[in-house]
Interface confidence: medium
């Protein structure tokens, strides 16, 4: 019951806490169980005891074994056991199961991955984070103190995450790595090939010369949070910003969630002071996500003046 598994890699720091807890004032003695030999407390030793902590600075494969800790108080003694295994470093990228800490699950709402055992060490931020041995890059990853946050989590984010940090002991630095699996919980969301609700394909929009006109591009992309989804307008196949006509601007609308729970986006194209030449342009509403791109084309036509005599 009062035994705990601990593991580490050779040439890295490993710090183990006694499974039996006591007040800080209680003394803790450590022994190597096989020989019943006392572990020294002098910090000059590579392996030494420091109260409730047993420190391997750094660890060696030969350190593997069972260590006994005895918490001594004026009225009782409590005994615990630490089963320590030190492994050789792997030459390849794979982290074997026996080096893995507990798996954590995340979702779009909660995607924190804590660096395991880090609270035992004297470390300074920031940590380095790796996924499947690759250093994490990009703005979706935010390292904060002892944990990593992933923005807009998706199923592809599942994998093995390794934190790496430096433990400092009396001015000497020791590397520590720890790996855990991260799984992504399905929140019943899904993504579809974009569906453009407006405008209709090849729609003709009537406008009045000299007046303002608005075109709305509206599309739905699936249910739940969408990692990559965008709607935009193009003029004659060119981005609005590159077209160079200040009268024609696009403005992002609000996220819409319809009664069926679909995730939809709007983009409004505003044309100020409609001119004759605007009728010659091709207006493309584009909706794109990870599945692909859908395009609906609109053309403008002159609205005929109302005939009051008919």
């Amino acid at each position: 019951k009062f035994s705990k598994q601990s593991w580490g890699l050779e040439n890295e720091a490993l710090i183990v806490r006694c499974p039996r807890q006591g007040k800080p004032s209680y003394t803790v003695d450590w022994y190597y169980s096989q020989t019943n030999k006392s572990i020294p407390t002098q910090e000059r030793n590579r392996v030494f005891a420091s109260g409730q902590l047993l420190k391997f600075l750094p660890a060696a494969v030969a350190d593997s074994g069972i260590y006994t800790c005895i918490v001594r108080s004026p009225t009782f003694n409590r005994t615990g056991y630490a089963n320590v295994t030190i492994y050789k470093k792997q030459s390849d990228c794979n982290v074997p199961d026996y080096l893995m800490y507990s798996t954590v699950s995340g979702s779009e709402k909660n995607s924190k991955i804590y660096c395991p055992t880090i609270d035992l060490y004297n470390w300074t931020a920031p940590l380095e984070w790796f996924k499947n041995c690759q250093a994490l890059q990009g703005s979706r990853y935010r390292a904060h103190k002892s944990f990593l946050v992933i923005d807009n989590v998706m199923t592809e984010d599942a994998g093995d995450y390794t934190c790496k940090f430096i433990h400092n002991e009396n001015g000497a630095n020791y590397s520590v790595t720890a790996t855990r699996s991260f799984t992504v919980k399905d929140e019943q969301g899904f993504s579809l090939f974009p569906v453009i609700g407006a405008p209709a394909q090849n729609e003709i929009k009537e406008v009045e010369i000299g007046k303002n006109a608005n075109l709305t591009c509206s599309a739905c992309f699936g249910k739940g949070t969408q990692f990559l989804a965008a709607v935009l307008w193009q003029l004659n196949g060119t981005k609005i910003t590159d077209f160079g006509e200040p009268r024609i601007q696009q403005e992002e609308g609000q996220n819409q969630s319809f009664s069926n729970g679909l995730a939809c986006l709007d983009m409004v194209l505003r044309i100020a002071d409609v001119k004759e030449e605007d009728l010659l342009l091709q207006y493309d509403c584009l909706a794109l996500n990870l599945h692909g791109l859908r395009r609906h084309t609109v053309r403008l036509s002159r609205k005929n003046p109302i005939d009051h005599h008919s």
Partner: antibody, heavy 116, light 107 residues
Framework: EVQLLESGGGLVQPGGSLRLSCAAS????????MSWVRQAPGKGLEWVSS????????YYADSVKGRFTISRDNSKNTLYLQMNSLRAEDTAVYYC?????????WGQGTLVTVSS | DIQMTQSPSSLSASVGDRVTITCRAS??????LSWYQQKPGKAPKLLIY???SLQSGVPSRFSGSGSGTDFTLTISSLQPEDFATYYC?????????FGQGTKVEIK
């Protein structure tokens, strides 16, 4: 047009409080992280605080932790910074910015002066 | 915390000059680096994100490069409107930190 507009700055005595607001328009505010960055007179830029789109994650610089509180109201498209126990060294122009790992756009800034 | 060190602190250059500003991180930050331009009395303006991506609307004479710890902002041909202070910023880890700034002045 994507725009951020700060307000709420002013002169306050040491130990006093201020609440800054940042009104966002032209983008889907509720989808983005937001941050506050400040700049003391004649000095460089200093990150102050960040908040995730749904307020699940909130980070502070050590220099303001325990004194400043960042919050947001997605229904009002507004970001806030509640500043308590203000010190002379908090005197700065405070900018709000949309945070995508990089800051863009920035508001025009609001000046906070802490002086007796 | 990650320290960002810019060099030089200031430089004098003429219109048409090629200008290079460097930024060094105290530890590897991947490509999580941005560059900003700030003019007196104005808010900073994003130029480059993820080390080398040019922000929409920014002239192509601005470019960024680098990865890990060493990064560079280059202005291929300095224009009158480019005289300003430039900052780098890392977003690898909180607290997000900025360089101390590089002031580009007219020679």
């Amino acid at each position: 047009e994507v725009q951020l507009l700060e307000s709420g700055g002013g002169l306050v005595q040491p130990g006093g409080s201020l609440r800054l607001s940042c009104a966002a328009s032209g983008f889907t505010f509720s989808s983005y992280w937001m941050s506050w960055v400040r700049q003391a007179p004649g000095k460089g830029l200093e990150w102050v605080s960040s908040i995730s789109s749904s307020s699940s994650y909130i980070y502070y610089a050590d220099s303001v932790k325990g004194r400043f509180t960042i919050s947001r109201d997605n229904s009002k498209n507004t970001l806030y910074l509640q500043m308590n126990s203000l010190r002379a060294e908090d005197t700065a122009v405070y900018y709000c910015a949309r945070d995508q790992g990089w800051f863009d756009p920035w508001g025009q800034g609001t000046l906070v002066t802490v002086s007796s | 915390d990650i320290q960002m060190t810019q060099s030089p602190s200031s430089l004098s250059a003429s219109v048409g000059d090629r200008v290079t500003i460097t930024c060094r991180a105290s530890r590897a930050i991947g490509n999580n680096l941005s560059w900003y331009q700030q003019k007196p009395g104005k808010a900073p303006k994003l130029l480059i994100y993820t080390a080398s991506s040019l922000q929409s609307g920014v002239p192509s004479r601005f470019s960024g490069s680098g990865s890990g710890t060493d990064f560079t902002l280059t202005i291929s041909s300095l224009q009158p409107e480019d005289f300003a202070t430039y900052y780098c910023q890392q977003s690898y880890s909180t607290p997000y930190t900025f360089g101390q700034g590089t002031k580009v002045e007219i020679k």
